[in-house]
Amino acid sequence: LADPLDHRDAGDLWFPGESESFEDAHVEHSISRSLLEGEIPFPPTS
């Protein structure tokens, strides 16, 4: 599996009308990535 992304949570960082996570870490926290065996919909990105 690919190395997890940095988790720079911006839950308390507010831009004009927006809250931004800076890094899309959903793949690293996906159901697919949680499966330790078998084929996963989110394979490691090259």
């Epitope: 992304l5 940095d6 988790h7 949570d9 839950g11 927006e18 809250s19 931004e20 996570s21 800076f22 890094e23 899309d24 959903h26 793949v27 926290h29 996906s30 159901i31 697919s32 949680s34 499966l35 330790l36 919909p41 989110f42 990105t45």
Partner: antibody
Framework: EVQLVESGGGLVQPGGSLKLSCATS????????MHWVRQASGKGLEWIAH??????????YYAESVKGRFTISRDDSKTTIYLQMNSLKTEDTAVYYC?????WGQGTTVTVSS | DVVMTQSPLSLPVTPGEPASISCRSS???????????LYWYLQKPGQSPQLLIY???NLASGVPDRFSGSGSGTDFTLKISRVEAEDVGVYYC?????????FGQGTKVEIK
């Protein structure tokens, strides 16, 4: 086999409350970020709520359309997420899906009508 | 909010022929790590959405390789190299970078 099974939908009057559940199985749940997405009949997809994992202090995020009325939560011991819906409006009528963005449940229908 | 705009909204297709759908975001979805937070879903009639492409160009497993995703920070394309009858449904692009997360309005693909 990964399963996401929503329940709790039904008919409710405007101003009423409803609690949706999404029971999951087939994968290690505790580190997974989960979401609720809804879809009004014949319309597109609308993201409404997101809950992160314990390691992220169970941070939650909401769409403006539901903020202050809906609450997303999770019980890691039951591998289940919830959506408590209060002060329901007719425009909340939709199919509600729980999802990890890769896998999706089959949806549960919420109808708000007098 | 980040507005996701898809075109066309309706796409009649011929089996065996190529097809493409465009999606434009109102701001860049490119992160500092070079990830583009653009996802494509297909919702077949009467079904839940299914993931096709994640992070702009990565094919979800189980998805036929006739599907591909490409684009830049704000302009994206989903291509089907050879449409099959089972590809009918509504295609959505989505961004999961900026709250609130947003979907495109959907492109309905149907056989001519």
């Amino acid at each position: 086999e990964v399963q996401l099974v929503e329940s709790g939908g039904g008919l409710v009057q405007p101003g009423g409350s409803l609690k949706l559940s999404c029971a999951t199985s087939g994968f290690p749940f505790s580190n997974v970020w989960m979401h609720w997405v809804r879809q009004a009949s014949g319309k597109g997809l609308e993201w409404i709520a997101h809950i992160k994992a314990k390691s992220d202090n169970y941070a939650t995020y909401y769409a403006e359309s539901v903020k202050g009325r809906f609450t997303i939560s999770r019980d890691d011991s039951k591998t289940t997420i919830y959506l408590q819906m209060n002060s329901l409006k007719t425009e909340d009528t939709a199919v509600y899906y729980c999802t990890g963005l890769d896998y999706w449940g089959q949806g549960t229908t919420v109808t708000v009508s007098s | 909010d980040v507005v996701m705009t898809q075109s066309p909204l309706s796409l009649p297709v011929t089996p065996g022929e190529p097809a493409s759908i465009s999606c434009r975001s109102s701001r860049s979805l490119l992160t500092s790590k070079g990830i583009t937070s653009l996802y494509w879903y297909l919702q077949k009639p009467g079904q839940s959405p299914q993931l096709l492409i994640y992070r702009m160009s990565n094919l979800a497993s189980g998805v036929p390789d006739r599907f591909s995703g490409s684009g830049s920070g704000t302009d994206f394309t989903l291509k089907i190299s050879r449409v099959e009858a089972e590809d009918v449904g509504v295609y959505y692009c989505a961004q999961f970078l900026v709250y609130p997360y947003t979907f495109g309005q959907g492109t309905k693909v149907e056989i001519k």
